[in-house]
Interface confidence: medium
């Protein structure tokens, strides 16, 4: 039938170790009030509870100071094992990274996981991408149909640890040359070669066509 307290005639059982630091204490339920600066911690075991007065709160709890009595309060931060205050975690549960008093399954953008401490540390900070450069090939901006254009970004802040890699700082993509033919009519030898090959192919195709027409006419006449 609930938890009926049997109050003692004495205010405190000094001999009882559970009454250490208590202002009022009972044999069955321990402390109900603590001395200043100590934290009241109410242990519950099934349907029974007893109070303790502690200098510091156990793991998973933080010290909450209040005008009437300081007490230990449970960490309510998700995936947190121990905390400094109601909303500041100091140690996360296994598999979670600590970042600014919170616990994350992966570090936020701009931060990298440090496996040895399970914390998110400042990653390699890079600046914004530059505009795409001029489309070129073999350092030329003409004379080809396709080329490559490149853009870059700077490392603004180096990572805290050398083991943390920086993201790519240069990237290229295929682009169409604005001038396929270079001004002044000069063409690269390669381009000339390509043109000759194309001409030759067209001549062969035309000859094959004419030969087919000839054969068809010949058969019709027979």
């Amino acid at each position: 039938q609930g938890n009926r307290w049997r109050r003692s005639k004495r205010a405190s059982y000094v001999s009882n170790p559970i009454c250490k630091g208590c202002l009022s204490c009972s044999k069955d339920n321990g402390c109900s009030r603590c001395q200043q600066k100590l934290f009241f911690f109410l242990r519950r075991e099934g349907m029974r509870q007893y109070g303790e007065c502690l200098h510091s709160c156990p793991s998973g709890y933080y010290g909450h100071r209040a005008p009437d009595m300081n007490r230990c309060a449970r960490c309510r931060i998700e995936n947190c094992d121990s905390c400094f205050s109601k909303d500041f975690c100091t140690k996360c549960k296994v598999g979670f990274y600590l970042h600014r008093g919170r616990c994350f399954d992966e570090c936020p953008d701009g931060f990298a996981p440090l496996e040895e401490t399970m914390e998110c540390v400042e990653g390699c900070e890079v600046g914004h991408w530059s505009e795409w450069g001029t489309c070129s090939r073999n350092n030329r901006t003409c004379g080809f149909k396709w080329g490559l254009e490149t853009r870059t970004r700077q490392i603004v802040k180096k990572p805290v640890k050398d083991t943390i890699l920086c993201p790519t700082i240069a990237e290229s993509r295929r682009c169409k040359m604005t001038m396929r033919h270079c001004p002044g009519g000069k063409r690269t030898p390669k381009a000339k070669e390509k043109r000759n090959k194309k001409k030759k192919r067209k001549l062969i195709e035309r000859a094959q066509e004419q030969h087919s027409v000839f054969l068809a006419t010949d058969r019709a006449n027979q």
């Epitope: 307290w5 009241f40 519950r44 709890y61 009437d68 449970r74």
Partner: antibody, heavy 125, light 107 residues
Framework: EVKLVESGGGLVKPGGSLKFSCAAS????????MSWVRQTPEKRLEWVAS???????YYPDSVKGRFTISRDNVRNILYLQMSSLRSEDTAMYFC???????????????????WGQGTSVTVSS | DIVMTQSHKFMSTSVGDRVSITCKAS??????VAWYQQKPGQSPKLLIY???TRHTGVPDRFTNSGSGTDYTLTISSVQAEDLALYYC?????????FGGGTKLEIK
Amino acid sequence: EVKLVESGGGLVKPGGSLKFSCAASGFSFSSYAMSWVRQTPEKRLEWVASISSGGSTYYPDSVKGRFTISRDNVRNILYLQMSSLRSEDTAMYFCARGGDPGVYNGDYEDAMDYWGQGTSVTVSS
Amino acid sequence: DIVMTQSHKFMSTSVGDRVSITCKASQDVSSAVAWYQQKPGQSPKLLIYWASTRHTGVPDRFTNSGSGTDYTLTISSVQAEDLALYYCQQHYSTPWTFGGGTKLEIK
């Protein structure tokens, strides 16, 4: 925003059974203890049941053996199964976050910080 | 079981007044007392827990004092919207128990 929505109340005969639910949203349901509290027609509040985040259940003697609290942490739903109902079980039943007797003291786990709008149960022949 | 007694079923006050609602526990509950407000047609709302900690969004005109067995909820300057039923609850020992409630009426 924490939201608790009860459903499934109604009129039931003495000795009968009823199961109702409470859909929770806006918080990490599986991390919190949940409770059922009822309000009698005379406006008295009575604690009915609590379930810890780990699934341990607690009841007052008045409902022990007749009522069963359970939870579905995947669907974020709290349930109350009531059987062998009596006329004194007639009340508005509220689902509330908190009220965990199984943990050590803390911020909200003992006090009930958010309540649903309630579902009415009438036990009458 | 711990019995929580709210001696006043009704209290009448005027807007701007200071009002105190009392609650007495049948034994020392180590400040593990919560106060709830229930407005007409609504569900209860937590105001204060652990005797002195205001819940999120609760105006600072609501305060609680007391220790051991005696606790008092004080509204420093009553507003029209404070018209409600007020309940105390001990969250020290199971079964959790509530006071019978005090209905605050505005003159």
